[in-house]
């Protein structure tokens, strides 16, 4: 069964800057990745970035840099200033549309006991929804 993992890390150098890493553990090819915060995309969450293998990447503030790490994982750096900046308990969600398997989404947040610069290992997060 495909799984999605989500890792959230606060940068030690910029305490209000976050890095979100997400990956897809499945056999299909990724057709779209959507990163949101505040809940799942389409369920009250706000889209931060969308990554498409051919057409490229779109990102919206406070997203600073979204990129593909591998064919099945992505990373997103968030700016940490301004009213729309994330806080320590913000939930981030990643939805992977895989062809032809379908869509899989998981969410994660900063581990409660994390020191800046540290993070939990990128273990699979609970799958919230599989379309």
């Amino acid at each position: 069964t495909p799984e999605v993992w989500v890792q959230v890390r606060m940068e030690a150098t910029e305490l209000s800057s976050f890095t979100i890493r997400c990956g897809f553990l499945g056999s299909g090819s990724i057709s779209l990745v959507t990163v949101s915060w505040g809940g799942p995309n389409g369920a009250g969450g706000t889209t931060l970035a969308v990554l498409h293998p051919e057409r490229g990447i779109r990102q919206w503030a406070p997203a600073r840099q979204a990129r593909w790490e591998t064919q099945s994982s992505i990373s997103l750096i968030l700016e940490g200033s301004g009213a729309s900046s994330p806080c320590a308990n913000t939930t981030f969600c990643c939805k992977f549309a895989s062809f032809p398997e379908g869509s899989w989404e998981a969410c994660g947040s900063l581990p409660p006991s994390s020191d800046p610069g540290l993070s939990a290992p990128p273990t699979p997060a609970p799958i919230l929804r599989a379309d």
Epitope: R55, G56, R58, W60, F99
Partner: antibody, heavy 118, light 107 residues
Framework: EVQLVESGGGLVQPGGSLRLSCAAS????????MHWVRQATGKGLEWVAA???????YYPGSVKGRFTISRENAKNSLYLQMNSLRAGDTAVYYC????????????WGQGTTVTVSS | DIQMTQSPSSLSASVGDRVTITCRAS??????LGWYQQKPGKAPKRLIY???TLQSGVSSRFSGSGSGTEFTLTISSLQPEDFATYYC?????????FGGGTKVEIK
């Protein structure tokens, strides 16, 4: 209500220039990719240009180097500067929004007519 | 560039008929395809995106299917307001390309 209104069309001689405008309202213009699509009389649709929310631009080979798409987010406006116009550029030009990237254009303007003729 | 071949280029049908229009991509585009309806003198209207997702506010008699290189738009029961020209659009990669169109006429 999401609305797109094109203007700037008209008659121009071959080799001439024209600048089309598209006024957007009813949505957060700066977030969305925007496109120009044209249609010659009795013909099909042809994608002409796109600009993303970061200002990066995309063109097909048929207009590359002659047409320039741009946007002014503060004015909720999209533009198409057309240079070195040819008779084959005669068409209705539509401005369109891609509101849910990357799923294609979801809202279109009513179009503005460009005629290239001597 | 990805070529989109649409067929038929025109068809005649009666109210109540089931109508099927096909679009073939010159290379695989997964499900990155939309369908548009255009009436004379009007701007195109999106019916379907991502091959099978119905645009909000569009009648459920329209449906889309397919993936990879073969796609289909089906009108389950043709209504008088459905007589129009239909186009497919691949939104997989630049340059975006449309099919040549299918004109649905009254028999």
């Amino acid at each position: 209500e999401v609305q797109l209104v094109e203007s700037g069309g008209g008659l121009v001689q071959p080799g001439g220039s024209l600048r089309l405008s598209c006024a957007a309202s009813g949505f957060t213009f700066s977030r969305d990719d925007m496109h120009w699509v044209r249609q010659a009389t009795g013909k099909g649709l042809e994608w002409v240009a796109a600009i993303d929310n970061a200002g990066d631009t995309y063109y097909p080979g048929s207009v590359k180097g002659r047409f320039t798409i741009s946007r002014e987010n503060a004015k909720n406006s999209l533009y198409l500067q057309m240079n070195s116009l040819r008779a084959g550029d005669t068409a209705v030009y539509y401005c369109a929004r891609e509101g849910q990237w990357p799923y294609g254009m979801d809202v279109w303007g009513q179009g503005t007519t460009v005629t290239v003729s001597s | 560039d990805i070529q989109m071949t649409q067929s038929p280029s025109s068809l005649s049908a009666s109210v109540g008929d089931r109508v099927t229009i096909t679009c073939r991509a010159s290379q695989g585009i997964r499900n990155d395809l939309g369908w548009y309806q255009q009436k004379p003198g009007k701007a195109p209207k999106r019916l379907i995106y991502a091959a099978s997702t119905l645009q909000s506010g569009v009648s459920s008699r329209f449906s889309g299917s397919g993936s990879g290189t073969e796609f289909t738009l089906t009108i389950s029961s043709l209504q008088p307001e459905d007589f129009a020209t239909y186009y497919c659009l691949q939104h997989n990669s630049y340059p975006l390309t449309f099919g040549g169109g299918t004109k649905v006429e009254i028999k």
